[in-house]
């Protein structure tokens, strides 16, 4: 009955500080409303990075000021986190909640370790 959530173990952000990964869940029920939350775990502290609720079959929409974007297809969510810097390197956990109809289910992935390397500044040219 528990909901299983799968996500990649490691992802490397690109030079523009953007990281993408897939969050896939095995749904025990027929949900029509799903909430996806990205959490960051650092030093046993957990903080919310972004969250979106969507109706199955529709696109998920994050708030305008969110650093996340994403698309959904069936039980799979493609997540992109932008504006990352080296200090943001850490474990990013995908949490999926089947909000409606009852019963409610929650699933938490094992986390994706995102590595972010700040680009070297361009050398001054004379």
């Amino acid at each position: 009955k528990a909901m299983h959530v799968a996500q990649p173990a490691v992802v490397l952000a690109n030079s523009r500080g953007t990281a993408s990964f897939v969050c896939e869940y095995a749904s025990p029920g027929k949900a029509t409303e799903v909430r996806v939350t990205v959490l960051r775990q650092a030093d046993s502290q957990v903080t919310e990075v972004c969250a979106a609720t969507y109706m199955m079959g529709n696109e998920l929409t994050f708030l305008d000021d969110s650093i996340c974007t994403g698309t959904s297809s069936g039980n799979q969510v493609n997540l992109t986190i932008q504006g990352l810097r080296a200090m943001d390197t850490g474990l990013y956990i995908c949490k999926v909640e089947l909000m409606y109809p009852p019963p409610y289910y929650m699933g938490i992935g094992n986390g994706t370790q995102i590595y972010v390397i700040d680009p070297e500044p361009c050398p001054d040219s004379d």
Partner: antibody, heavy 118, light 108 residues
Framework: QVQLVESGGGVVQPGRSLRLSCAAS????????MHWVRQAPGKGLEWVAV????????YYADSVKGRFTFSRDNSKNTLYLQMNSLRAEDTAVYYC???????????WGQGTLVTVSS | EIVLTQSPGTLSLSPGERATLSCRAS???????LAWYQQKPGQAPRLLIY???SRATGIPDRFSGSGSGTDFTLTISRLEPEDFAVYYC?????????FGQGTKVEIK
Amino acid sequence: QVQLVESGGGVVQPGRSLRLSCAASGFTFSSYGMHWVRQAPGKGLEWVAVIWYDGSNKYYADSVKGRFTFSRDNSKNTLYLQMNSLRAEDTAVYYCARGGLMGAFDYWGQGTLVTVSS
Amino acid sequence: EIVLTQSPGTLSLSPGERATLSCRASQSVSSSYLAWYQQKPGQAPRLLIYGASSRATGIPDRFSGSGSGTDFTLTISRLEPEDFAVYYCQQYGTSPWTFGQGTKVEIK
């Protein structure tokens, strides 16, 4: 720091109504699902109801379904539990609790006692 | 509904001893969704462990959780005077959210 403060408890006759409140502070209230949990005197914990972060959905325990209504006002950082058709078995301390980011109930209020007696 | 059964009902131990509390689920519960709470008389419950084995903020390392499937354990390695209380397990992976009936850890 996170604080949850319940109020509104008291003694009420069977069949009557009561409304509990829970004032929240110290966190972004509108980002969290919130719960009511009750504890009858000398007994264990019983989950009562949940309301999602935006108030869109609510689930209730079978024992209170159709009699209790859970609502929230995110502009006031406050939860409400409207309890109608109260029964003697509803006598308990009622706690509001925050559904933490990882799912467990990470912060609890101090509780408010509801006694249903004639 | 997932029913959680805790044992023993009461555990009589002395300070400094090790306490082992059991929680058994009526059906499989992912370890990600099992929590333990401590409650002292006249106080609200306090979250100790979430995800079966992760300590909540500020919880001393003498408290540890383990288990998977249907069998979970809370261990207190060396009982301190302030640890004598009632302990509840809870599953929060699906509705309705359910608690065990509690284990009372009392001074022998």
